[in-house]
Amino acid sequence: GSTVPPMVNVTRSEASEGNITVTCRASGFYPWNITLSWRQDGVSLSHDTQQWGDVLPDGNGTYQTWVATRICQGEEQRFTCYMEHSGNHSTHPVPSGNSHHHHHHHH
């Protein structure tokens, strides 16, 4: 089948006092191979501080997955979610407050 780029959205939720959990979700993509990970200070965030969801079919012939990490409140700017799919990539910041960011991939 043809390539379908993911929709990526980043959300935040309160985890504990002074900490937040940031979750990066990719959905509606095909084929299933995707890289989704968090970067801190422009470099890779260690794997043991990230939690990944399985890549699962979403019922529309496409796939979805997620990656999450816990960070200190006030340091959101230092983190970005990186997505690579079928040769295209994008980076997605943590939204401020309780807003959500929805992005299609870009070159």
Partner: antibody, heavy 119, light 107 residues
Framework: DVQLQESGPGLVKPSQSLSLTCTVT?????????WNWIRQFPRNKLEWMGY???????NYNPSLKSRISITRDTSKNQFFLQLISVTTEDTATYYC????????????WGQGTLVTVSA | DIQMTQSPASLSASVGETVTITCRAS??????LAWYQQKQGKSPQLLVY???MLADGVPSRFSASGSGTQYSLKINSLQPEDFGSYYC?????????FGAGTKVEIK
């Protein structure tokens, strides 16, 4: 556009301190990004030295950690490099640069300033 | 620390030729790689980031590829303005390190 300009003495004596300034125009260093120092030795080897980020957090190359300090003056939109106890091995062209948090690559560099360590 | 090994150290080529420069990392850097071009007496200029993505304004005769520990930069139909030195840099982890460079000279 972000522009960076290095300045400082071109000649430093061994055992003394090297001090350089990077003046940033077109962007506030407290808004975002990591503000870096990189040097290039006479035989062209490049070495990342460290950064100070938008919030004042620093990160240094472990090979220099005991000798390096990066500070800033937010009122002048400048950041600084200090390297103590220099030797002739610290002779290099020193560049300031920055990177965004989407990845630690360097989109723009200053023009560089040559520092010679010699008695 | 991750060490970056570039080859060749230098090469001579004619205008119109195709040249390839390679960079090997001492560990898996998962496409966290950038390439720079430097002309004599000038600052390095970003060519490629995320291993394959051309920076703004970089001509399409440049292309990059690789994965894991092995990466390459290819210049198709070399132009007079392409002569100079080329450096790779990883950003998988700190400290950030550069390759020793490849000098591309006119034949």
């Amino acid at each position: 556009d972000v522009q960076l300009q290095e300045s400082g003495p071109g000649l430093v004596k061994p055992s003394q301190s090297l001090s350089l300034t990077c003046t940033v125009t077109g962007y506030s260093i407290t808004s975002d990004y990591a503000w870096n120092w990189i040097r290039q030795f006479p035989r062209n080897k490049l070495e990342w030295m460290g950064y100070i980020n938008y919030s004042g957090t620093t990160n240094y190359n472990p090979s220099l950690k005991s000798r390096i300090s990066i500070t800033r003056d937010t009122s002048k939109n400048q950041f600084f490099l200090q390297l103590i106890s220099v030797t002739t091995e610290d002779t290099a062209t020193y560049y300031c640069s920055y990177y965004r948090y989407d990845g630690a690559w360097f989109p723009y560099w200053g023009q560089g300033t040559l520092v010679t360590v010699s008695a | 620390d991750i060490q970056m090994t570039q080859s060749p150290a230098s090469l001579s080529a004619s205008v119109g030729e195709t040249v390839t420069i390679t960079c090997r990392a001492s560990g898996n850097i998962h496409n966290y790689l950038a390439w720079y071009q430097q002309k004599q007496g000038k600052s390095p200029q970003l060519l490629v980031y995320n291993a394959i993505m051309l920076a703004d304004g970089v001509p399409s005769r440049f292309s990059a590829s690789g994965s894991g520990t092995q990466y390459s930069l290819k210049i198709n139909s070399l132009q007079p303005e392409d002569f100079g030195s080329y450096y790779c840099q990883h950003f998988w982890s700190f400290p950030l390190t550069f390759g020793a460079g490849t000098k591309v000279e006119i034949k």
